[in-house]
Interface confidence: medium
C-alpha cells in the first residue's frame, strides 16, 4: 500500500511537472522544503531544489538510471549535511540505500528556529524592496516563498503559493507606480485568512 | 557543499595594488551580503569591508582600510571584488571571503558569527 500510494505521488509530480513547468515545480518545492527543514538556510534550500527538480526531470522522462543515482547522490548530502538541514533526518540517514530516500521524502517537519524576524522589515519597510526585486526576481521572490513558508508549517503548498504570487503581482504593479512603498506597504493585510 | 572562492592575492610594494574577487558557485548568493575579512600571522581574523548583495549595495569598511579599499560586486557573475590601492606593510595577511546568511535587507555585519560561508583565503604580502 505504501508504494502504491508513493506511485501515485510520483505520478502527480510528473503530471505537475510537465503542465506547470520547471518554475511552478521549483516554487512548490521551495514552499514544502522550507516546511519540512525551516533551520537550513535559503542558499541551502536552493540547493535541495535544484537537485530535487534535477531528480523529478530525469524520473519522469524515464531516464531510469539517470534518476536513481542522482536521487542517490542527494539523500547522501542531505544525510552528509543533516546539521545544517534537519535536526529530524538522523532515523532515515541510519537506513539502507533503499530505504533513505523514502524515509527522506516523508520526514516530518523539523521545529522552526526561535525568534525568527518579523518578514515587513525585509519584504514591505525596506526602501530597497523594488531595486532587490528588479535586480533578481526569482531570487528575491524565492525568499520570500522560503521566509513565509518557514514561518507557517500550518498553510498549505497551495495557499503558500497563491500568496507568493499575489506578493509578485504587488511589487509588478507598485514597482512601475509613482510611489512604489506607498502602493505595497498593505500588501501583508491582503494575506490575512 | 555551497562553494566560495577566493583569488587575485600575490606579492606588491607598498602603496601597489590588488584586485581580490571572490566567486560563489550558487545563484542564490545574490541574496546575502557578502564580507572580506583577513588573518595576520599570530592576530585574530578581523572585518574588512562588506556589502549587501541587492541593489542598493549598502557598503561598509574598517576604519584601517576606508578610502583605499573599495568593495563591490557583480550580481550576473555571482562574484564581489575587493580593490586594494596604496597598500602598506600592515595589509599582509590571509583575506577570506564569507556569505552571510541574513535576510536581503540586512547591512553586511562586522561579526563573523553572521557568515556562513567561508571560501579557504587568499595570501596578500606587501613588502616594504
Known amino acids: 500500500d505504501e508504494g502504491k500510494a508513493s506511485s501515485a505521488k510520483q505520478r502527480l509530480k510528473c503530471a505537475s511537472l510537465q503542465k506547470f513547468g520547471e518554475r511552478a515545480f521549483k516554487a512548490w518545492a521551495v514552499a514544502r522544503l522550507s516546511q519540512r527543514f525551516p533551520k537550513a538556510e535559503f542558499a541551502e534550500v536552493s540547493k535541495l531544489v535544484t537537485d530535487l527538480t534535477k531528480v523529478h526531470t530525469e524520473c519522469c522522462h524515464g531516464d531510469l538510471l539517470e534518476c536513481a543515482d542522482d536521487r542517490a547522490d542527494l539523500a547522501k548530502y542531505i544525510c552528509e549535511n543533516q546539521d545544517s538541514i534537519s535536526s529530524k533526518l538522523k532515523e532515515c540517514c541510519e537506513k539502507p540505500l533503499l530505504e533513505k530516500s523514502h524515509c527522506i521524502a516523508e520526514v516530518e517537519n523539523d521545529e522552526m528556529p526561535a525568534d525568527l524576524p518579523s518578514l515587513a522589515a525585509d519584504f514591505v519597510e525596506s526602501k530597497d524592496v523594488c531595486k532587490n526585486y528588479a535586480e533578481a526576481k526569482d531570487v528575491f521572490l524565492g525568499m520570500f516563498l522560503y521566509e513565509y513558508a518557514r514561518r507557517h508549517p500550518d498553510y498549505s503548498v497551495v495557499l503558500l503559493l497563491r500568496l507568493a504570487k499575489t506578493y509578485e503581482t504587488t511589487l509588478e504593479k507598485c514597482c512601475a507606480a509613482a510611489d512604489p512603498h506607498e502602493c505595497y506597504a498593505k500588501v501583508f493585510d491582503e494575506f490575512k485568512p | 557543499q555551497l562553494q566560495v572562492v577566493e583569488s587575485g592575492g600575490g606579492l606588491v610594494q607598498a602603496g601597489g595594488s590588488l584586485r581580490l574577487s571572490c566567486a560563489a558557485s550558487?545563484?542564490?548568493?545574490?541574496?546575502?551580503?557578502m564580507g572580506w575579512f583577513r588573518q595576520a600571522p599570530e592576530k585574530e581574523r578581523e572585518f574588512v569591508a562588506g556589502?549587501?548583495?541587492?541593489?542598493?549595495?549598502?557598503?561598509d569598511y574598517a576604519d584601517s582600510v576606508e578610502g583605499r579599499f573599495t568593495i563591490s560586486r557583480d550580481n550576473a557573475k555571482n562574484t564581489a571584488y575587493l580593490q586594494m590601492n596604496n597598500l602598506k606593510p600592515e595589509d599582509t595577511a590571509v583575506y577570506y571571503c564569507a556569505i552571510s546568511h541574513q535576510l536581503p535587507g540586512g547591512r553586511p555585519g562586522r561579526d563573523m558569527d553572521s557568515y556562513s560561508y567561508w571560501g579557504h583565503g587568499t595570501q596578500v604580502t606587501v613588502s616594504s
Open positions: 556589502i549587501s548583495w541587492f541593489a542598493g549595495a549598502t557598503t
Open positions: 550558487e545563484r542564490t548568493f545574490v541574496a546575502y551580503p
